[in-house]
């Protein structure tokens, strides 16, 4: 019993003056609380609590369920307790079957004993199954059995409290342990799409998926640099014991340009937080932007291949694409494909394959593309480099020798005189007149050059060479003439092509 110091309030005294009392089932429980300021008796066992305002607690016929802690409290809030065991061979355990344990914490299997003198108070697995090897516990006859440091692996573990009575093992009702997982990582968050591109008035809907070990994970959609609460809807699932999934869907039914921005899905648990963002761009109308991959001015050698390639952005999706040359649409030799397989892709590539180009196939090649909102086009000017071709080489009535050559780039015509029968013409002759004939038209086809010299300057037998050349190659034509007396014979032209 507590010692009393004069002038200082003291706890009440209880009779019988023991900390524990054992009575048989059916016997009387009589407890007396002595204190000038007596307030009440309180009885506690498991989740049950009873009160009594009499200073003497009497239970005429004790039952196993009367086992528990009896506490007397005075007006100063001071108290004293006695624990009563009501021994009932037919009911060795008082049981509260709810059993929850937080991972890494201790949890109590609530199966207090009605008889403290039984032996081997412990836990056993159901149906004779062994308990997990690492499961440690501490028995307490008044409270139950404390499982130390609950593991996630113990979830749904079936167990009994067990004692030995007269050499036999007696089991309590079964308990199923439900483990509440501890957060050992931040939530896993993902978003349905990293970016959205919409036209005004279209619906914006984005889903954030939050995965964690339990449903106590917190999540929300936030707009960056804004405190406005966003409207979101939730769906959730438990995929197995420690695999929880929540889907938080954010919707703006009619998006406006000023809704453009970054939206963040934020989630946190006791371990930490995670977030993922999605970008919304709202445009007032669709668009197409074309980027040439090669120079829009193309020089290609005669007989060679070239690709005209564009990359373009189109939103909404492109509906019509075509390549045009001289008002004719190509039906083949071109392809159009998305730049990426991503569903939010807005970039595309179009290629026109021009094969074995001829000198006559230079000109403007146009790529046209349209969607439901806009049209766009880009033109390529294709120049075909061709070796000069000598179109005409004549002696005119005025005695001029004239050479007309066509090619691209513009050919240069040089004149040479070869005296007698020499094959090599080295002495150059200055032309009297040089003209580019079709410079007024678009310079895609061959350029035609005309050059003339005065044949009266030649006083000896020989050959005149007209040589036309450009970056691609050269071609020559020859005029043979002979003198008979003072008269020039007929001039015989012929050509020699030099690759």
């Amino acid at each position: 019993q507590p010692s009393v110091s004069p002038g200082e309030p003291s706890p009440p005294s209880i009779h019988p003056g023991k900390s524990d009392l054992i009575v048989r089932v059916g016997d009387e429980i009589r407890l007396l609380c002595t204190d000038p300021g007596f307030v009440k008796w309180t009885f506690e066992i498991l989740d049950e609590t009873n009160e009594n305002k009499q200073n003497e607690w009497i239970t005429e016929k004790a039952e196993a369920t009367n086992t528990g802690k009896y506490t007397c409290t005075n007006k100063h809030g001071l108290s004293n307790s006695i624990y009563v065991f009501v021994r009932d061979p037919a009911k060795l355990f008082l049981v509260d079957r709810s059993l929850y344990g937080k991972e890494d914490n201790d949890t109590l299997v609530r199966c207090p004993l009605t008889d403290p003198e039984v032996t081997n108070y412990s836990l056993k697995g159901c149906q004779g199954k062994p308990l997990p090897k690492d499961l440690r516990f501490i028995p307490d006859p008044k409270a139950g059995i404390m499982i130390k440091s609950v593991k996630r692996a113990y979830h749904r573990l079936c167990l009994h409290c067990s004692v030995d009575q007269e050499g036999k093992s007696v089991l309590s009702e079964k308990f199923i342990l439900k483990v509440r997982p501890a957060f050992k990582a931040v939530p896993v968050v993902s978003v349905s799409k990293a970016s959205y591109l919409l036209r005004e008035g279209e619906e914006f809907t984005v889903t954030c998926t939050i995965k964690d070990v339990s449903s106590s994970v917190y999540s929300t959609w936030k707009r960056e640099n804004s405190q406005t609460k966003l409207q979101e809807k939730y769906n959730s699932w438990h995929h197995g014991d420690f695999n929880y999934e929540r889907q938080a869907t954010l919707t703006i039914s009619s998006a406006r340009v000023n809704d453009s921005g970054v939206f963040m899905c934020y989630a946190n648990n006791t371990f930490g937080s995670a977030n993922v963002t999605t970008t919304l761009e709202v445009v007032d109308k669709g668009f197409i932007n074309i980027f040439p991959m090669i120079n829009t001015t193309v020089f290609v050698n005669d007989g060679e291949n070239v690709d005209l390639i564009v990359e373009y952005e189109a939103f909404p999706k492109p509906e019509h694409q075509q390549w045009i040359y001289m008002n004719r649409t190509f039906t083949d030799k071109w392809e159009d494909y998305p730049k990426s397989e991503n569903e939010s892709n807005i970039r595309y590539v179009s290629e026109l394959h021009l094969t074995r180009l001829k000198g006559t196939e230079g000109g403007t090649y146009t790529f046209l593309v349209s969607n439901s909102d806009v049209n766009a086009a880009i033109a390529f000017n294709v120049y075909v480099n061709t070796k000069p071709e000598i179109l005409t080489y004549d002696r005119l009535v005025n005695g001029m020798l004239q050479c007309v050559a066509a090619g691209f780039p513009e050919p240069t015509i040089d004149w040479y005189f070869c005296p007698g029968t020499e094959q090599r013409c080295s002495a150059s002759v200055l032309p009297v007149d040089v003209q580019t004939l079709n410079s007024s038209g678009p310079p895609f086809g061959k350029l035609v050059v005309q050059s003339s010299i005065d044949s009266s300057a030649f006083k000896h037998n020989g050959t005149v060479e007209c040589k036309a050349y450009n970056d691609v190659g050269k071609t020559s034509a020859y005029f043979n003439f002979a003198f008979k007396g003072n008269n020039k014979e007929q001039i015989h032209p012929h050509t020699l092509f030099t690759p």
């Epitope: 991959m293 090669i294 120079n295 690709d307 392809e335 397989e341």
Partner: antibody
Framework: EVQLVESGGGLVQPGGSLRLSCAAS????????MHWVRQAPGKGLEWVAS????????YYADSVKGRFTISADTSKNTAYLQMNSLRAEDTAVYYC??????????WGQGTLVTVSS | DIQMTQSPSSLSASVGDRVTITCRAS??????VAWYQQKPGKAPKLLIY???SLYSGVPSRFSGSRSGTDFTLTISSLQPEDFATYYC??????????FGQGTKVEIK
């Protein structure tokens, strides 16, 4: 006449760098896509990288991504391959090629790169 | 990425023989397949582009064809200068360029 001439190959230590050049003549590289392809001794062909010299778009094989850089100078009509953090497995003859209609129609003579300590 | 499996890896043939080399794409591809010839110490030379188009200057005994994901190079009558290694090459939108492993054509 179309011609491609590679240069810049040689012996280099692992971890070292090398810059290959591909001088083009007979055509304008800004009208085409230029590629580098390599061939390890006794092995097959492996595509390395490509560039559209006019627009600057570049593409790389996974095996060289982050280590090699393809570039071009249209005024010099030349393509380049800057190779950093070279490894023994980068030892090969490196070819420069012109690309048209999903094929490589003109190739250079190749330049040998040897990575060895 | 799309793989191109070339077969056979080598073959022996005589002058005048008809020779067929096959490349199989691991998945459906466009007709963007080319064939090259390479001789020792030399750069590859383009023979066929777009699966069946003969490149200019290439003899007409070379031809290309396609059947589903199988692409075939045929030499109708093998000539002495045709002994070399042949490569197929495929272009795909998202994987760019891949080559077959090569087929060495040797003299029997």
């Amino acid at each position: 006449e179309v011609q491609l001439v590679e240069s810049g190959g040689g012996l280099v230590q692992p971890g070292g760098s090398l810059r290959l050049s591909c001088a083009a003549s007979g055509f304008n590289i800004s009208s085409y896509s230029m590629h580098w392809v390599r061939q390890a001794p006794g092995k097959g062909l492996e595509w390395v990288a490509s560039i559209y010299p006019y627009s600057g778009y570049t593409y790389y094989a996974d095996s060289v991504k982050g280590r090699f850089t393809i570039s071009a100078d249209t005024s010099k009509n030349t393509a380049y391959l800057q190779m950093n953090s070279l490894r023994a497995e980068d030892t090969a003859v490196y070819y420069c090629a012109r690309y048209v209609y999903h094929a490589l129609d003109y190739w250079g003579q190749g330049t040998l790169v040897t990575v060895s300590s | 990425d799309i793989q191109m499996t070339q077969s056979p890896s080598s073959l022996s043939a005589s002058v005048g023989d008809r020779v067929t080399i096959t490349c199989r794409a691991s998945q459906s591809v466009s007709s963007a397949v080319a064939w090259y010839q390479q001789k020792p110490g030399k750069a590859p030379k383009l023979l066929i582009y777009s699966a069946s188009s003969l490149y200019s200057g290439v003899p007409s005994r070379f031809s290309g064809s396609r059947s589903g994901t199988d692409f075939t190079l045929t030499i109708s009558s093998l000539q002495p200068e045709d002994f070399a290694t042949y490569y197929c090459q495929q272009w795909a939108v998202h994987s760019l360029i891949t080559f077959g492993q090569g087929t060495k054509v040797e003299i029997k």
